[in-house]
C-alpha cells in the first residue's frame, strides 16, 4: 500500500476554495522529490495539473498553487474559484505520476447556495458585519418590524422596532427603517460570532397579512493563509480588517492550545517576552490595515497566528480576524550567525550580517531595535555612506567579507549600546536577522591613547598596543569616514610593554602622520583582522591645532586624555519605525520612500535573541 495519505473525499461549493494536504514519510529523498496533483482520466491515465517543479496547467492558471513543507512531510494543494467542472477523481503523489507513490482523492463541488424557497443566503466572515434586508408591503409600513432566529423548532426574537434587543446581540445590532419612499427595513449585526449562524426570519406586521422573508446566515472562520519561511529569517503578516475597525486596538496573537490565543503584540503596548527585540508592529493606514514583522524566526515560532481588532487588544468573540499558519523551514538558506555578541565597556564588537548573496548590490542597513510603543528600528548606518550623527567615528558598515555576509563594527562601547540590532537590506525582506549586543565586565584588549592633539606641519605618532592573543592576526590602522575605514601605513615597533604576563608576541604598532594638515583631523582606528574577517578595534580622535612649539609629537598611553564616554548627540537621524518604515524594500510594505532622514531621536531597549550561539567582541 502507498505511504502517501490525504483526504479521501473533499466536498465544497462553487466559488469556494479548498486546501488539500497530502502527507508523506519525510525521508530525505521524499522531501526533495517532485510533488504533483493530477486528475484521473476515464482511461486510467493521470494528467498533471500542478507540480512542485513549477508546472501549472492552463485549467489552474491563476487559481492554484502547490506548496511543499519538507519538515512536516506534507504538501498542500490550494485550489480557488471552484466550479462543478472541478468535480472528479484526483491523485496527490510523489515522483512520477505512473509510479504509484500516490493517494486517491475524490473532489465534489456542488452548486453554490442561492435563493432556495425564498431564502436569501448571507455568507460572512467571523467578526465582520452583515446587513439583512427585509422588504415589506405598504399596508405594513406602520406596523412592528422584527427579526427572529430559528432555534430548534422555535423562532426566538432577536430585535424589533419597539426597542427590544435579545441579550445575545446587545451592543452589536440595530434595526434601520429606510426612508418613506423605500419599503425595506434592515437589520445590521456586527462583530459576528460563529454562534450567530443559522436561519433567520424578518417580519413586518404581526397578523396573517404580515410580510415575511427568510435569511440563512453562514458565518465562516477565516481560512488560514499558509506561510512558509526559513529558520533565522523573517516573516511579515499583513492584516487588513477594514475601515470599520480603523480606530479599534489591533493585535497579533498565536494560538497555543485550541481556542487560547496568546497576544504576541498589540497596539496597546503589550508584547510577548519571546518576541522581544525581533518584532515590529507597523502602524495602521487610514483603512485600519497594519503589518507585523518578526525576525530571527525560531522553530518554536511555527503555528497559527491571528490578527484582529478589539478594544481589549486581544482575541474576543466577535473580533474580526485574519489567520495564518506559519511553517518554519529548518532546511534554511539563511546561514547561522551569532545571535549574541559580547563586548566590554570601551571595547568593540564586529557583527557579521548575512544577506541573500544573489543581491550583492543591495543597500545594507543596520538599525537599533527599540521596544517603546509598538517597536521601531531607527537606522544607524548604511552601505551608501550614511551614519547617524552620534555614531560618527565609532560605527562602520563594511561590505566584507562579501558573498552573502557584511560586517558592522561598533567601538567605544558603553552600557547604553546593549540591546538588539537588526541587519537588513533593501532587497530580500526575508533576510532580516537580529543580534543582541551584551556589555560584559572586562577591559578592552587593544590599548590606545585617549583623544590626541596634533600640531599643524609636525609629525604625530600614535601607538596601539596589541596583546599576544592577537599574534596571528593582521594588525592595521585606518582613518574612519562615513563610507568605511581607509587603511593607512603603520609601523611594527616590536613587543609592547603595556601588558602584564604577555610575552614577546605582544605588539606595539604605531600610526605616523607626517607634516600634519587640517585634513588629518578625525577618527582613527587600530584593529585586528584575519583575511576579510574583522576582530576588535579601538578608536582615537586626532584634533589638529596651530603650532605652539617646535618638534614632533609622540603620544604615549600615559599622556593620553581620558576618552569621553560618548560623543555629543546630534539629531540627524534615519529610522525604520512604526510610522517610518517607509522604505518598502526594507519592510515589504509596497509603499515608497527611498531615504527617510527624520529629525527625531529615540531610546534603546534590549531583547531576547534567536539562539544561544554567542560571539565575543574581540575575535572570531
Amino acid at each position: 500500500k502507498s505511504p502517501i495519505f490525504g483526504p479521501e473525499e473533499v466536498n465544497s461549493v462553487e466559488g469556494n476554495s479548498v486546501s488539500i494536504t497530502c502527507y508523506y514519510p519525510p525521508t530525505s529523498v521524499n522531501r526533495h522529490t517532485r510533488k504533483y496533483w493530477c486528475r484521473q482520466g476515464a482511461r486510467g491515465g493521470c494528467i498533471t495539473l500542478i507540480s512542485s517543479e513549477g508546472y501549472v496547467s492552463s485549467k489552474y492558471a491563476g487559481r492554484a498553487n502547490l506548496t511543499n513543507f519538507p519538515e512536516n512531510g506534507t504538501f498542500v494543494v490550494n485550489i480557488a474559484q471552484l466550479s462543478q467542472d472541478d468535480s472528479g477523481r484526483y491523485k496527490c503523489g510523489l515522483g512520477i505520476n505512473s509510479r504509484g507513490l500516490s493517494f486517491d482523492v475524490s473532489l465534489e463541488v456542488s452548486q453554490g447556495p442561492g435563493l432556495l424557497n425564498d431564502t436569501k443566503v448571507y455568507t460572512v466572515d467571523l467578526g465582520r458585519t452583515v446587513t439583512i434586508n427585509c422588504p415589506f408591503k405598504t399596508e405594513n409600513a406602520q406596523k412592528r418590524k422584527s427579526l427572529y432566529k430559528q432555534i430548534g423548532l422555535y423562532p426566538v426574537l432577536v430585535i424589533d422596532s419597539s426597542g427590544y434587543v435579545n441579550p445575545n446581540y446587545t451592543g452589536r445590532i440595530r434595526l434601520d427603517i429606510q426612508g418613506t419612499g423605500q419599503l425595506l427595513f434592515s437589520v445590521v449585526i456586527n462583530q459576528l460570532r460563529l454562534s450567530d449562524a443559522g436561519q433567520y426570519l424578518c417580519q413586518a406586521g404581526d397578523d396573517s397579512n404580515s410580510n415575511k422573508k427568510n435569511a440563512d446566515l453562514q458565518v465562516l472562520k477565516p481560512e488560514p493563509e499558509l506561510v512558509y519561511e526559513d529558520l533565522r529569517g523573517s516573516v511579515t503578516f499583513h492584516c487588513a480588517l477594514g475601515p470599520e475597525v480603523a480606530n479599534v486596538a489591533k493585535f497579533l496573537c498565536r494560538q497555543s492550545s485550541g481556542e487560547n490565543c496568546d497576544v504576541v503584540v498589540n497596539t496597546l503596548g503589550k508584547r510577548a517576552p519571546a518576541f522581544e527585540g525581533r518584532i515590529l508592529l507597523n502602524p495602521q493606514d487610514k483603512d485600519g490595515s497594519f503589518s507585523v514583522v518578526i525576525t530571527g524566526l525560531r522553530k518554536e515560532d511555527a503555528g497559527r497566528y491571528l490578527c484582529g481588532a478589539h478594544s481589549d487588544g486581544q482575541l474576543q468573540e466577535g473580533s474580526p480576524i485574519q489567520a495564518w499558519q506559519l511553517f518554519v523551514n529548518e532546511e534554511s538558506t539563511i546561514p547561522r550567525s551569532p545571535t549574541v555578541v559580547k563586548g566590554v565597556a570601551g571595547g568593540s564588537v564586529a557583527v557579521l550580517c548575512p544577506y541573500n548573496r544573489k543581491e550583492s548590490k543591495s543597500i545594507k542597513y543596520w538599525c537599533l531595535w527599540e521596544g517603546a510603543q509598538n517597536g521601531r528600528c531607527p537606522l544607524l548606518v548604511d552601505s551608501e555612506g550614511w551614519v547617524k550623527a552620534q555614531y560618527e567615528g565609532r560605527l562602520s558598515l563594511l561590505e566584507e567579507p562579501g558573498n552573502g555576509t557584511f560586517t558592522v563594527i561598533l567601538n567605544q562601547l558603553t552600557s547604553r549600546d546593549a540591546g538588539f540590532y537588526w541587519c537588513l537590506t533593501n532587497g530580500d525582506t526575508l533576510w532580516r536577522t537580529t543580534v543582541e549586543i551584551k556589555i560584559i565586565e572586562g577591559e578592552p584588549n587593544l590599548k590606545v591613547p585617549g583623544n590626541v592633539t596634533a600640531v599643524l606641519g609636525e609629525t604625530l605618532k600614535v601607538p596601539c598596543h596589541f596583546p599576544c592573543k592577537f599574534s596571528s592576526y593582521e594588525k592595521y590602522w585606518c582613518k574612519w569616514n562615513n563610507t568605511g575605514c581607509q587603511a593607512l601605513p603603520s609601523q611594527d615597533e616590536g613587543p609592547s610593554k603595556a601588558f602584564v604576563n604577555c610575552d614577546e608576541n605582544s605588539r606595539l604598532v604605531s600610526l605616523t602622520l607626517n607634516l600634519v594638515t587640517r585634513a588629518d583631523e578625525g577618527w582613527y582606528w587600530c584593529g585586528v583582522k584575519q583575511g576579510h574577517f574583522y576582530g576588535e578595534t579601538a578608536a582615537v580622535y586626532v584634533a589638529v591645532e596651530e603650532r605652539k612649539a617646535a618638534g614632533s609629537r609622540d603620544v604615549s598611553l600615559a599622556k593620553a586624555d581620558a576618552a569621553p564616554d560618548e560623543k555629543v548627540l546630534d539629531s540627524g537621524f534615519r529610522e525604520i519605525e512604526n510610522k517610518a518604515i517607509q522604505d518598502p524594500r526594507l519592510f515589504a510594505e509596497e509603499k515608497a520612500v527611498a531615504d527617510t532622514r527624520d529629525q527625531a531621536d529615540g531610546s534603546r531597549a534590549s531583547v531576547d535573541s534567536g539562539s544561544s550561539e554567542e560571539q565575543g567582541g574581540s575575535s572570531r
Partner: nanobody, 127 residues
Framework: EVQLVESGGGVVQAEDSLRLSCAAS????????MGWFRQAPGKEREFVAA??????????YYADSVKGRFTVSGDNAKKTLDLQMKDLKPEDTAVYYC??????????????????WGQGTQVTVSS
C-alpha cells in the same frame, strides 16, 4: 467543561452494520476537526476515520483497514459526528473513541491532532 459523548456501541454479528454517534458540548468554538479512534484489548489506540471543516469545505479521511466499509459524517455547527459501519469483522472489535480539535492542522491520523476526547463506546463483533 468540554464533553464528548459517544453512543451506538453494542454487540453485533460479523457482516452486520452499526452506527456510532458523538455529541460535543461545551466546545468554545465549533470544532474544525473531529475523528474516530479505536483501541482493541492489548493494542494501541489506532485511527479509524476523521472529518475536517475549513470554510465551506469538508475533508474526510479513512484508515486503510476501513475504507469502503465505514463512512464518516458530521455537522460542524451542531458539533456532532457519526460513523456508519458496514460489513463488520471480528477484528473491528474495540472501544471506539470520539475526538475533536478546534484547529484543522496536524496529521488527522495522530492522536496529538486532537485536544478533546470522549470516554469511548464498546463495539463487539462476534463471528
Amino acid at each position: 467543561e468540554v464533553q464528548l459523548v459517544e453512543s451506538g456501541g453494542g454487540v453485533v454479528q460479523a457482516e452486520d452494520s452499526l452506527r456510532l454517534s458523538c455529541a460535543a458540548s461545551g466546545l468554545p468554538f465549533s470544532s474544525s476537526r473531529m475523528g474516530w479512534f479505536r483501541q482493541a484489548p492489548g493494542k494501541e489506540r489506532e485511527f479509524v476515520a476523521a472529518i475536517g471543516w475549513s470554510g465551506r469545505s469538508t475533508y474526510k479521511y479513512y484508515a486503510d483497514s476501513v475504507k469502503g466499509r465505514f463512512t464518516v459524517s458530521g455537522d460542524n455547527a451542531k458539533k456532532t459526528l457519526d460513523l456508519q459501519m458496514k460489513d463488520l469483522k471480528p477484528e473491528d472489535t474495540a472501544v471506539y473513541y470520539c475526538a475533536a480539535h478546534p484547529d484543522y492542522y496536524g496529521d488527522p491520523r495522530t492522536s496529538g491532532a486532537y485536544r478533546y476526547w470522549g470516554q469511548g463506546t464498546q463495539v463487539t463483533v462476534s463471528s
